[in-house]
């Protein structure tokens, strides 16, 4: 008799999830010599232990504690780049500017980037059919709780000047409901963080508007200022040129506004 299985509204666990996490861990520890001591089998066991046999709407930050411990890593607190709705450019940037870090440049962020996972209560099975959707089903699901946990810890670790890359092509350049707007902004530590500097990335080539005057940016400035953190904002009019100038800062065309 086939067992009844809960149908959730979101996509199921990414296929070959265990193999993917393990392979990513091995790759990361090979690329980053300072993480070579990490036992990737233990990392997978801790990851699995956070959600296997647990109701996928009842996951807590505590469930991920064993994984957090194994993911201990040095991150220069003044070299943190946050992002919202513009992940690809943020990652292209840190691939060039190697001393800066997004969350996905850390082991834990790298392991989980773009993956979905969930289990089922009282069975050791991974659910490849469906997983809870944050809006339609529940917010305390394995994926959402993971990202909320690591995003909070990443923001807590930041110091001095923190940068955030924002997508100027979206109707809400700063979205209070994004991970940046709902988690990271509120977990920057005012005693450690002096300034949040927003980089607003323009989409259209002919777009010369000052998007730092956008009402949602003003809202971000207000939230940050109330937390006793200074705020600054820069328009990145030409992201292609911006990346090029990060690669080759001596280029004569890089002295003008980007």
């Amino acid at each position: 008799v086939p067992r009844w299985r809960q149908q959730w509204s979101g996509p199921g666990t990414t296929k070959r999830f265990p193999e993917t996490v393990l392979a990513r861990c091995v790759k990361y520890t090979e690329i980053h010599p300072e993480m070579r001591h990490v036992d990737c089998q233990s990392v997978w066991d801790a990851f699995k232990g956070a959600f296997i046999s647990k109701h996928p709407c009842n996951i807590t930050e505590e469930d991920y504690q064993p994984l957090m411990k194994l993911g201990t890593q040095t991150v220069p607190c003044n070299k943190i780049l946050l992002w919202s709705r513009i992940k690809d450019l943020a990652h292209q940037f840190t691939q060039v500017q190697r001393d800066m870090f997004t969350l996905e440049d850390t082991l834990l962020g790298y392991l989980a980037d773009d993956l979905t996972w969930c289990g089922e209560f009282n069975t050791s099975k991974i659910n490849y059919q469906s997983c809870p959707d944050w809006r339609k089903d529940c917010s305390n699901n394995p994926v959402s709780v993971f990202w909320k946990t690591v995003s909070r810890r990443f923001a807590e670790a930041a110091c001095d000047v923190v940068h955030v890359m924002l997508n100027g092509s979206r109707s809400k350049i700063f979205d209070k409901n994004s991970t940046f707007g709902s988690v990271e902004v509120h977990n920057l530590q005012p005693e450690k963080v002096q300034t949040l500097e927003a980089w607003v990335i323009h989409g259209g080539r002919e777009d010369s508007r000052d998007l730092c005057q956008d009402p949602t940016i003003k809202e971000l400035e207000s939230i940050i200022s109330k937390r006793n953190i200074q705020f600054s904002c820069k328009n990145i009019y030409r992201p292609d040129k911006f990346l090029q100038c990060v690669k080759n800062p001596e280029d004569s065309s890089c002295t003008s506004e980007i």
């Epitope: 850390t106 690591v150 810890r153 807590e156 110091c159 530590q189 005693e191 450690k192």
Partner: nanobody, 117 residues
Framework: EVQVLESGGGLVQPGGSLRLSCEAS????????MSWVRLAPGKGLEWVST????????SYADSVKGRFTISRDNSKNTLYLQMNSLRAEDTAVYYC??????????RGQGTLVTVSS
């Protein structure tokens, strides 16, 4: 600016004890969870222990549980690590860091603990 100064390390025989201290400044000490992490020769950064801002909650790595005790004195802005039943594998430079991890930027010079007969 967060500043920390670790002390108390030294050479000790297996089974021996040490007490590490970390004096912190530049921030409201009691507002922050604090952690000890260690860097052993040829290995990567390992989390050892964390204590909440009030001192009411503590957690430990499995490798040190039952042997190490973390504590703090908020009136002195100081973090401690009492290390008992020391083993050769505890040999490392010990750093204190603000926060609970897993992302750390330790600011001090650390204090070297060598366990050897």
């Amino acid at each position: 600016e967060v500043q920390v100064l670790e002390s108390g390390g030294g050479l000790v025989q297996p089974g021996g004890s040490l007490r590490l201290s970390c004096e912190a400044s530049g921030f409201t000490f009691s507002n922050f969870a604090m952690s000890w992490v260690r860097l052993a020769p040829g290995k990567g950064l390992e989390w050892v222990s964390t204590i909440s801002g009030s001192g009411g909650s503590t957690s430990y790595a499995d490798s040190v549980k039952g042997r190490f005790t973390i504590s703090r004195d908020n009136s002195k802005n100081t973090l401690y690590l009492q290390m008992n039943s020391l083993r050769a594998e505890d040999t490392a430079v010990y750093y204190c860091a603000d926060g609970r991890g897993p992302f750390f930027d330790y600011r001090g010079q650390g204090t070297l603990v060598t366990v050897s007969s």
